[in-house]
Interface confidence: low
């Protein structure tokens, strides 16, 4: 089955700058600004565009050692990024993949809204564990806040 979870979160960072840092340079930023959450990001294949495979490794103590993400779409004009978790982590007997869509929308106050859709593709009639959805949401939120803090402290970066 397919289980869809949608969420919105806001940021004080302008959309274009946030897309540049959080989406386009997340591979470099995440281990730097949130080493407690992501220990490394390794490019397995591709140049960052659709089809690119990345291996995201987690610190010791996490329930999962790594996940592999596949980039599905990068829209620099509309600040959209689609990717799928295809291996490692929760992917296995009951879960086939997780398709994620992130869209960053500018707000009148100069900040932005992140619209996030997570589609869990389960095998057979298996359901999604609430704990997994929560964990994924918390991971995203913490990475976002870490990047946000970095950008606020480094006003010259990613402009």
């Amino acid at each position: 089955g397919v289980f869809n979870y949608e969420t919105e979160t806001t940021s004080v960072i302008p959309a274009a700058r946030l897309f540049k840092a959080f989406i386009l340079d997340g591979d470099n930023l995440f281990p730097k600004v949130a080493p407690q959450a992501i220990s490394s990001v390794e490019n397995i294949e591709g140049n960052g565009g659709p089809g690119t495979i990345k291996k995201i490794s987690f610190p010791e103590g996490f329930p999962f050692k790594y996940v592999k993400d596949r980039v599905d779409e990068v829209d620099h004009t509309n600040f959209k990024y689609n990717y799928s978790v295809i291996e490692g982590g929760p992917i296995g007997d009951t879960l086939e993949k997780i398709s994620n869509e992130i869209k960053i929308v500018a707000t009148p106050d100069g900040g932005s809204i992140l619209k996030i859709s997570n589609k869990y593709h389960t095998k057979g009639d298996h359901e999604v564990k609430a704990e997994q959805v929560k964990a994924s949401k918390e991971m995203g939120e913490t990475l976002l806040r870490a990047v946000e803090s970095y950008l606020l402290a480094h006003s010259d970066a990613y402009n």
Epitope: P59, G61, F62, P63, A135, E138, A146, S149
Partner: antibody, heavy 127, light 111 residues
């Protein structure tokens, strides 16, 4: 440098109140659960309370429930412990400590221990 | 509530020799995700506590590899492969599976 600094301790009469503060620096304060732990003179460590990174979830030890209140100001990177109806047995050194990385709830998948501690502040409850 | 019991209360040690401290919980600390929610802390004389081991066996950042955590469920052990003079202090285990609670502590001192 990652650090926590407690303040606000002092001498207070039984039944009185005191508010402790713990100021964080060197890390993204709002991403971490924070704890209060105390140590009575010559005794062991006693966990007092914790609060989630976003301040929405708090838990207290039975010994302080209903009398102590933990809160945080993520803009000022400060943790608070409001202590009311103080008793002689609350006399202790109070430490704040950084807990798990997380944002909204007590999520067990991301637990790294209490890895940063403050120097402690002394609370004496006596008439 | 989960009760944590440590032994021994006091442990005289010889530098260079191994040492071990036991910690027992009144309920299993093994979570369904496979991790044991038990930490070990050391409080050196006149100092704040410091984290040694989390999740039963994971050494915290900067902790020497002579320290190791072992055990699962209700029985846990902190081992020091070769005690050094700087290791003196009170060692505490702590469970975080439910509302956190510490063991009573084990005082390690040089013979």
């Amino acid at each position: 440098e990652v650090q926590l600094v407690e303040s606000g301790g002092g001498l207070v009469q039984p039944g009185g109140s005191l508010r402790l503060s713990c100021t964080a620096s060197g890390f993204t304060f709002s991403s971490y659960m924070t704890h209060w732990v105390r140590q009575a003179p010559g005794k062991g460590l006693e966990w007092v309370s914790h609060i989630s990174g976003d301040g929405t979830n708090t838990t207290y030890a039975d010994t302080v429930k209903g009398r102590f209140f933990t809160s945080r100001d993520n803009v000022k990177n400060t943790l608070f412990l409001q202590m009311d109806s103080l008793r002689a047995e609350d006399t202790a050194v109070y430490f704040c400590a950084r807990g798990s990385w997380y944002t909204t709830g007590w999520h067990r998948n991301y637990y790294f221990g209490m890895d940063v501690w403050g120097q402690g502040t002394t609370v004496t409850v006596s008439s | 509530d989960i009760v944590m019991t440590q032994s021994p209360l006091s442990l005289p040690v010889t530098p260079g020799e191994p040492a071990s401290i036991s910690c027992r919980s009144s309920q299993s600390l093994l979570h369904s995700n496979g991790y044991n929610y038990l930490d070990w802390y050391l409080q050196k004389p006149g100092r704040s506590p410091q984290l040694l081991i989390y999740l039963g066996s994971h050494r915290a950042s900067g902790v020497p590899d002579r320290f190791s955590g072992d055990g699962s469920g209700t029985d846990f052990t902190l081992k020091i492969s070769r005690v050094e003079a700087e290791d003196v202090g009170v060692y505490y285990c702590m469970q975080v599976l439910q509302t956190p609670s510490f063991g009573g502590g084990t005082k390690v001192e040089i013979k």
